[in-house]
């Protein structure tokens, strides 16, 4: 890496991938192992993130880029970048601090993660409910029970179970 | 571990000179700057210089430049310090440092330095 | 040479308090500020880089803040085992210079 100047900062041509290197008189020293400089102009090299434990690598640590992590299963990520993994859980619950608890009556959740969340209220749309809601599905809605036809019922058994990881379109 | 070892104490004549040891284990010595920094009793720091050991480079403060010398051994991993014509103003507590990796130029392990007395 | 000023050269404070050591630089060091302990015994531990990094194995009471010329180390919640002196120095530009040091005492 030749020594680079410029008439104002003389790191400001030092690329990404190199750092101005104080100790060698500012010329443009390419970033050690381990390390990374994502941005031109560097005076120092980032270390690179370690993806350990429950974190697992989805891309490696370059000279110009950090790595990235995501989790390994039975977890999944949390906050940016992944800065956490949380444990996942059943459709069905939602994880507490005592671990993963089965959803209340009137709750449900399709997901491995999140939180519970009350069935919908058809009436409040003035629907009626066609399908009941459990503990992974929420209650599907149909018509008012006034556009009904006569000696029909507004309530039908449960929908068969769908695949894991489907919401109800 | 990372180790920075330094004999305690050194007694120095005036107008001679002296050689500060500092031997580094646990690490790729060849792999990170050294450097040197000086307290006087009950007083503050100061930055003398510091030597790459791969390709000896080195840096000094030009307050020390004339009479401090920086060498390494690197088949002993040792670094050197060699000051040449000590006066009183030069009796203080010397360590050697290893500045940490990349760089943020912080030194990240200190030895436990080494007392010079000079005194005749 | 950039000087850093450490205007408290020793400061009292009694176990369990949150005391906040400051750093003032002469210029710019766009965050290139370290901090050290120095134990009586002379040992001195590095404690944070680039102005809020924490080194490895340092308890988490210890912070460091601060951008442009003015920095500063916090100690949430004061140990008998902090009773140190705290150094300041910059890594922005040759030569490496160190503060005065502020001495942290139990009152």
């Known amino acids: 890496f030749e020594r680079t100047r410029s008439l104002q900062d003389p790191c400001s041509n030092c690329p990404a991938g190199t750092f101005c290197d104080n100790n060698r008189n500012q010329i443009c020293s390419p970033c050690p192992p381990n390390s990374f400089s994502s941005a031109g102009g560097q005076r120092t090299c980032d270390i690179c993130r370690q993806c350990k434990g429950v974190f697992r690598t989805r891309k490696e640590c370059s000279s110009t880029s950090n790595a990235e992590c995501d989790c390994t299963p039975g977890f999944h990520c949390l906050g940016a970048g992944c800065s956490m993994c949380e444990q996942d859980c059943k459709q069905g619950q939602e994880l507490t601090k005592k671990g993963c608890k089965d959803c209340c009556f009137g709750t449900f959740n399709d997901q491995k993660r999140g939180i519970c969340r009350p069935w919908t209220n058809c009436s409040l749309d003035g629907k009626s409910v066609l399908v009941n809601g459990t503990k992974e599905r929420d209650v599907v809605c149909g018509p008012s029970p006034a556009d009904l036809s006569p000696g029909a019922s507004s309530v039908t058994p449960p929908a068969p179970a769908r695949e894991p990881g489907h919401s109800p379109q | 571990q990372v180790q920075l070892q330094q004999p305690g104490a050194e007694l120095v004549r005036p107008g001679t000179s002296v050689k500060l040891s500092c031997k580094a284990s646990?690490?790729?010595?060849?792999?990170?700057?050294i450097n040197w920094v000086k307290q006087r009793p009950g007083q503050g720091l100061e930055w003398i210089g510091n030597?790459?050991?791969?390709?000896?480079?080195?840096n000094y403060n030009q307050k020390f430049k004339d009479r401090a010398t920086l060498t390494v051994d690197k088949s002993s991993t040792t670094a050197y310090m060699q000051l040449s014509s000590p006066t009183s103003e030069d009796s203080a507590v010397y360590y050697c440092?290893?500045?940490?990796?990349?760089?943020?130029?912080?030194?990240?392990?200190w030895g436990q330095g080494t007392s010079v007395t000079v005194s005749s | 040479d950039i000087q850093l000023t450490q205007t408290t050269s020793s400061l009292s404070a009694s176990l369990g308090d949150r005391v906040t050591i400051s750093c003032r630089a002469s210029?710019?060091?766009?965050?290139?500020l370290n901090w050290y302990q120095q134990k009586p015994d002379g040992t001195v531990k590095f404690l944070i880089y680039y102005t809020s990094r924490l080194h490895s194995g340092v308890p988490s009471r210890f912070s460091g803040s601060g951008s442009g010329t003015d920095y500063s180390l916090t100690i949430s919640n004061l140990e008998q085992e902090d009773i140190a002196t705290y150094f300041c120095q910059q890594g922005h530009t040759l030569p490496y210079t160190f503060g005065g040091g502020t001495k942290l005492e139990i009152k």
């Open positions: 030597i790459y050991p791969s390709d000896t480079y080195t």
């Open positions: 440092t290893r500045m940490g990796d990349p760089f943020y130029y912080a030194v990240d392990y």
């Open positions: 210029q710019d060091i766009s965050n290139y």
């Open positions: 646990g690490y790729t010595f060849t792999s990170y700057w």
